[in-house]
Interface confidence: low
């Protein structure tokens, strides 16, 4: 899978979405979750209601929730309050039985407020993932890269 | 194989000036995070400031915020830190690192470059 | 900041358990997960991750290794200590800007 990276605003709102194929994964719940390591597990966050034909429905855990339209083939998972440790890289799954699969990597980054006149360095952004060598990148304004452009060019 | 190679260091007068490079190999540069992380003779580690894939985005700590600037180069692969107004206390071996996922808290330093010596003295 | 504090050495036998101790005045959990990570430094080298995330073993590393712990107490286990072992350890934690421990040196009896 290419990963495509989501930017948000410190203390804002975050939408994630991970489309996918309603027919194939019909009757499937969903989750998100968090990739700790190249290897490593991907650590449950929150996952679609029990009732698969309840998934519209909105589930929290914390400041995470997430929504499935099962008829429109979008999985969305809204990020509250977005804080630094909320950056990292996550998955989107349909689960069926024990298994997983996954739907869309995705890399959170949070951007400093610009309004906020606290120095930019209070807010710590660390470092990126092994599997991220063919990135796209969805700003929360809906701008994608083309494969091979530099994600985040600089400003300054 | 990634390798992270480290160039600039060497003896410099207290209030001038150095420029540290590391050219990175063996990985697609652009994608990930960078890092310095220095050490004083016969001390701990300590991180310095971290870089965002496009440099858009970088940090440091307290003792070095204005005197120090972390950027890198992506079509050369290159990472760099340009050090101000240098003081004695900066004597340290820099090194170049990695860093494992992009976020905020921290993630880890996966690769380590082998480091360059800075020292500060008149 | 948060403050890590290791103790300074520690020396034991070939073949024994070393156990070496970080402890943050500050939680670095976070959604269940401990941003507590720990490298090892031999004498003239860069440093190298071990344990990353409190407890998975990095790429390549021995299963002599091991982490455990969470929240402000962490734990580094290296056993049986061989004798390439001997290095300064660190911890290091993720959970705000990345600080390190002050070291430990692991010395053989």
């Known amino acids: 899978h290419n990963t495509t990276v989501f930017q948000g605003v410190a203390g804002q709102s975050l939408q994630v979405s991970c489309p996918y194929d309603s027919m194939k994964h019909w009757g499937r719940r969903k989750a998100w979750c968090r990739q700790l390591g190249e290897k490593g597990p991907c650590q449950r966050v929150v996952s679609t209601h029990n009732l698969w034909l309840l998934s519209f429905l909105r589930r929290w855990n914390g400041s995470t929730a997430i929504t499935d339209d099962t008829l429109g083939g979008t999985l969305t998972i809204t990020l509250r309050n977005l804080q630094p440790h909320d950056a990292g890289l996550y998955q989107c799954q349909s689960l069926h039985g024990s298994e997983a699969d996954t739907l869309r990597k995705v890399l959170v980054e949070v951007l400093a407020d610009p309004l906020d006149h606290r120095d930019a360095g209070d807010l710590w952004f660390p470092g990126e993932s092994e599997s991220f060598e063919d990135a796209h990148v969805e700003h929360s304004i809906s701008r994608s890269l083309l494969e091979g452009e530099i994600p985040f060019p600089p400003t300054s | 194989e990634v390798q992270l190679v480290e160039s600039g260091g060497g003896l410099v007068q207290p209030g001038r000036s150095m420029k540290l490079s590391c050219a990175a190999l063996g990985f697609t540069f652009s994608n990930y995070y960078m890092a310095w992380v220095r050490q004083a003779p016969r001390k701990g580690l300590e991180w310095v400031a971290s870089i965002s894939t496009g440099g858009d985005n970088t940090y440091y700590r307290d003792s070095v915020k204005g005197r120090f600037t972390i950027s890198r180069d992506n079509a050369k692969s290159t990472l760099y830190m340009q050090m101000d107004s240098l003081r004695s206390e900066d004597t340290a071996t820099y090194y170049c690192v990695r860093s494992f996922i992009v976020g905020t808290t921290g993630y880890y330093f996966d690769y380590w470059g082998q480091g360059v010596m800075v020292t500060v003295s008149s | 900041d948060i403050v890590l504090t290791q103790s300074p050495a520690l020396a034991v036998s070939l073949g024994q358990r070393a156990t070496i101790s970080c402890k943050t005045n500050?939680?670095?959990?976070?959604?269940?997960?401990?941003?507590m990570h720990w490298y090892q430094q031999t004498p003239g080298q860069q440093p190298k991750l071990l344990i990353y995330f409190a407890s998975n073993l990095a790429s390549g590393i021995p299963a002599r290794f091991s982490g455990r712990g969470s929240g402000t107490d962490f734990t580094l286990t290296i056993d049986p200590v061989e004798a390439d072992d001997t290095a300064t350890y660190y911890c290091q934690q993720s959970r705000n800007l990345p600080t390190f421990g002050g070291g430990t040196k692991l010395e053989l009896k």
């Open positions: 500050q939680n670095v959990d976070y959604y269940g997960n401990n941003y």
